[in-house]
């Protein structure tokens, strides 16, 4: 039975009907509904929202909607013992304290249960000492401090500005440098766009605004107490000392008004260059310690947060496939927020809600997708991607056998300039073809396709006439599906103009000011960008679930594999003498990539020609496509990162948000000139080339004719 027969509607009509049913006004209404109170993971409010979504998805027409709960490690401030940082004088008197909460936005003054800014999973502690300013606390910033400036952070409290890399990497770097505490702050250079007013008069960060966030280094583990396995009723939990990824030193975030008071007194070394200066009226001296008159003053942290095993709830909705019910296409995004979640996550959750409603409407009219679609509202994403990871751990055997694709649906917007897509190369052609069929919402592109406006505003650096599509990194709920399980994944949202706005993320990210009004007044008053994102995400899900042949093009993987091989070879060739000394060769990798390219090309030819009316052959070809991403998984994982198992892509070891290609080789080569045992270090490079070459060759062979 073809999918046309199964659904009784032609595929083209189906897609149009689905897209036409998506309405901006509904997304707006859903966003409002989801953002009136905080929905912090582990709270009653977020449980109530889970039950509301379950009920509404059932009303929309899904076949089943269940809550999946887990008991995971979360972190909360102590309600009676607030966290803060002090400047203390020689007598130990507190002469300045950082704020205890953010000044509430207009209309929200009487809202209870707004969690004050904190760094989730910070240990308790009251360290005091001299301050050292460490710029963004990136690997290269500590190299500059320690190697070039000879500044020792051991026993110091470091202050780092947010931006550029994931905050957990900053904390890890500070720990490795010997710091005894970390202060994170938002500098206006990164979180205040010139010419825009601060909230509530614009979308910029006010001086009292603070970015919350977790500071874990989980490397894909999920719940810190149950790595690899679901945190269910009979789980064996590690002791807190053995928990995965917890920071060992106190950490606390502040806004730029508080940072001003800490940084204005800094003495010691001048900043090494202009890249270390932000936009505050302070010298950006590195320290250690305060200048002359204030040299006897110290900084003291007061951190009293607690880690608690708490119940979380995912909502899992199912729309059963008519032809291949054992093939799953998953659309998932999180529900938990730090406060109101105006952008993160509810701009995404509202879009998912409208996509579910549209699919439900079609189902009520007698239509079903060819494959099963699973919809997920994840919990505790903000605490380390916990809800999605625990569910995937619980269902890993089903997912690795049946998972076709995962489309992520966190924040729909981080700006209103153009589309941003990160995905597996298998989805490039799907995204290109889909965006050519969608109308651009952009001013000046009326009557033009989304593909056209996107390509114009965000051109590919390699291929003219094509848009930029980025590598998947992490920091969101696709991680477990892609990096651990090898399920083809993608994400799409509207973004800012990276050329003119060099700030990190969007200014009000994870602050109390991320409200419905922020979106409705400043980002997307007509909700046209939200609608476009709904069409892209929904359209991808529709095609993945309904096309007879999976819309994956393995030839695009061949192209990027060659690009990544060239790139990693170039990095290695910065050490020609060592490559010669230790007989380091990339021949096996380039050979494997060549084989992959040839086999992928032949597979694509067969894909055009095979008899699609033969369900066995169709299923066989589709399985080869589905399992291609899976073939890049190394069951042993990457060195010291067992849950990052994808050999082609992993989150950067220096920035969880960024994707790195051939990460095993990359990490082996990183800073290799400083390794104490060069022979051992280059031996590891060779081993990683071997693993990569083998994996690419093995993946290629999954595309060969089966017999």
């Amino acid at each position: 039975k073809s999918s046309n027969e199964a659904t009784n509607i032609t595929p083209k009509h189906n897609m149009k009907a689905f897209l036409d049913e998506l309405k901006a006004e509904n997304i707006k209404k859903f966003l409002y509904n989801f953002t009136q109170i905080p929905h912090l993971a582990g709270t009653e409010q977020n449980f109530q929202l889970a039950k509301q979504i379950q009920s509404q998805w059932k009303e929309f027409g899904l076949d089943s909607v269940e809550l999946a709960h887990y008991d995971v490690l979360l972190s909360y401030p102590n309600k009676t013992h607030p966290n803060y940082i002090s400047i203390i004088n020689e007598d130990g008197n507190e002469i300045f304290n950082t704020s205890l909460f953010e000044p509430p936005p207009p209309g929200y003054e009487n809202v209870s249960d707004i969690v004050p800014p904190f760094s989730a999973f910070s240990p308790q502690g009251m360290p005091e000492g001299d301050l050292v300013y460490v710029n963004y606390a990136r690997t290269e910033d500590f190299f500059k401090l320690e190697r070039d400036m000879k500044i020792n952070c051991s026993g110091k409290i470091v202050i780092a500005r947010y931006g550029k890399v994931f905050r957990g990497n900053k904390v890890k770097n500070a720990q490795l440098a010997g710091a005894k505490g970390v202060i994170l702050y938002s500098d206006p250079a990164d979180y205040f766009a010139p010419g825009v007013k601060s909230y509530p008069d614009g979308w910029n960060l006010p001086g009292g605004g603070v970015q919350r966030g977790n500071i874990l280094n989980l490397n894909g583990a999920g719940d810190p107490l149950t790595p690899g396995y679901p945190a269910n009723e009979y789980a064996y939990r590690r002791g807190i000392a053995e928990a995965v990824g917890l920071p060992s030193i106190p950490v606390h975030p502040i806004g730029y008004y508080d940072a001003q008071k800490l940084l204005e007194k800094m003495g010691g070394s001048a900043p090494p260059d202009s890249s270390w200066r932000g936009s505050l009226k302070v010298p950006y001296n590195v320290g250690p310690g305060f200048t002359g008159n204030f040299s006897t003053q110290k900084v003291k942290m007061h951190i009293h947060s607690t880690n608690e095993v708490t119940r979380i709830y995912n909502v899992i909705g199912t729309l059963r496939g008519a032809v291949e019910p054992d093939r799953y296409v998953i659309l998932g995004g999180h529900r938990d927020s730090w406060v109101f979640g105006g952008i993160d996550p509810q701009s995404g959750a509202a879009v998912v809600h409208e996509i579910v409603r549209s699919f439900g409407t079609l189902k009520k009219e007698g239509w079903r997708p060819r494959r099963t679609i699973l919809f997920a509202s994840w919990d505790a994403e903000e605490f380390g991607l916990l809800g999605s990871t625990e569910w995937a751990e619980e269902n890993s055997r089903l997912l690795q056998e049946r998972g076709v694709a995962y489309i992520n649906a966190d924040s729909s917007i981080e700006g209103n300039y153009t589309l941003r897509v990160d995905c597996t190369p298998l989805m490039y052609s799907l995204v290109h073809n889909l965006t050519k069929e969608l109308k651009s919402p952009d001013e000046g592109f009326e009557g033009k396709s989304l593909y056209e406006s996107w390509t114009k505003k965000s051109p590919s650096p390699e291929f003219s006439g094509m848009p930029r599509i980025s590598k998947l990194g992490s920091g969101n709920d696709f991680e477990v599906f892609f990096q651990r399980l090898g399920i083809a994944s993608g994400r799409a949202r509207y973004t800012k103009n990276w050329e003119t706005n060099k700030f990190s993320g969007y200014p009000l990210y994870h602050s109390v000011y991320e409200t419905y009004e922020l979106v409705e007044k400043f980002y997307d008053p007509m909700f046209k960008y939200h609608l476009t994102v709904a069409q892209v995400r929904g359209g991808m899900v529709f095609e993945l679930a309904n096309s007879i042949v999976l819309p994956f093009d393995c030839r695009d993987y061949a192209v990027v594999l060659r690009k990544y091989a060239d790139k990693i070879y170039s990095i290695s060739m910065k050490h020609p003498q060592e490559m010669k000394t230790y007989s380091v060769s990339f021949d096996s990798l380039f050979s494997a990539v060549k084989n992959f390219t040839e086999i992928a090309s032949k597979f694509s030819e067969r894909l055009q020609d095979f008899d699609k009316s033969n369900p066995i052959v169709l299923r066989m070809m589709n399985d080869q496509l589905m399992f291609l991403e899976r073939a890049f998984i190394d069951p042993l994982g990457l060195p010291d990162r067992p849950f990052y198992r994808h050999v082609i892509y992993a989150p950067s070891s220096h920035n969880k948000y960024a994707g790195e290609s051939f990460p095993g080789i990359y990490d082996a080569l990183f800073d290799i000139e400083s390794k104490v045992d060069p022979s051992k270090a280059w031996g590891e490079v060779k081993r990683q080339i071997y693993v990569a070459a083998f994996t690419v060759q093995a993946a290629a062979e999954t595309l060969s004719e089966v017999a």
């Epitope: 803060y84 509430p104 003054e109 001086g207 001003q260 008159n293």
Partner: antibody
Framework: EVQLVESGGGVVQPGRSLRLSCAAS????????MHWVRQAPGKGLEWVAV????????YYADSVKGRFTISRDNSKNTLYLQMNSLRAEDTAVYYC??????????????????WGQGTTVTVSS | QSVLTQPPSASGTPGQGVTISCSGS????????VNWFQQLPGTAPKLLIY???QRPSGVPDRFSGSKSGTSASLAISGLQSEDEADYYC???????????FGTGTKVTVL
């Protein structure tokens, strides 16, 4: 209309206590720092104390340190000054004032933009 | 005793200009912004200048502020009879950890 109305002044004997209140309206009280300033008869202005929006910081003039306590109740939109161990030299008109926002620093380091009309405290035996 | 020093008085005829000085130190004027207040007889003080030289809405542009190093000044051009008042400079003092007012200057319109 932004308004600050002080109350609680009066005549009090040396060594006794008094609590001044300042009722705020017409602005979002919880988001502003607040000051107390006084003016002795025929004298200039003397700053007394300031409190941040969240009470994380309280600063006092040396002349009142250890005797006066500034506090606020954001749910009531009210600022307080608890004055203990009063002295004759505390005799003055006491003004409450809203901290001034300039966009570069916490408002409580920036002075005042809106003042109440004042309440008179007389310390006399 | 105030740490910001002002002349006790200044005067001028209508239409004339007058300048009031305010002398401080590195811990107040030298490192923090200066405000100026006007107090008309029998009334509460009113903000005249903030952030060294900014006028709140409603304050005539006859009033201007400036700062250099550890000193500040308030200039009143085109003096008018309603300008007769006490004028105070003020700033946060980092050493005292408190706000300080100047000694005050009585402006008389002759």
């Amino acid at each position: 209309e932004v308004q600050l109305v002080e109350s609680g002044g009066g005549v009090v004997q040396p060594g006794r206590s008094l609590r001044l209140s300042c009722a705020a309206s017409g602005f979002t009280f919880i988001t502003y720092g607040m000051h107390w300033v006084r003016q002795a008869p025929g004298k200039g202005l003397e700053w007394v104390a300031v409190v941040s929006f969240d009470e994380s910081n309280k600063y006092y003039a040396d002349s009142v340190k250890g005797r006066f306590t500034i506090s606020r109740d954001n749910s009531k939109n009210t600022l307080y000054l608890q004055m203990n161990s009063l002295r004759a030299e505390d005799t003055a008109v006491y003004y409450c004032a809203r901290a001034l926002r300039d966009g570069n620093n916490w408002d409580y380091f920036n002075g005042m933009d809106v003042w109440g009309q004042g309440t008179t405290v007389t310390v006399s035996s | 005793q105030s740490v910001l020093t002002q002349p006790p008085s200044a005067s001028g005829t209508p239409g004339q200009g007058v300048t009031i000085s305010c002398s401080g130190s590195s811990s107040n004027i030298g490192s923090n912004t200066v405000n100026w207040f006007q107090q008309l007889p029998g009334t509460a003080p009113k903000l005249l200048i903030y952030s060294d030289n900014q006028r709140p809405s409603g304050v005539p542009d006859r009033f201007s502020g400036s700062k250099s190093g550890t000193s500040a000044s308030l200039a009143i051009s085109g003096l008018q009879s309603e300008d007769e008042a006490d004028y105070y400079c003020a700033a946060w003092d980092d050493s005292l950890n408190g706000y300080v007012f100047g000694t005050g200057t009585k402006v008389t319109v002759l």
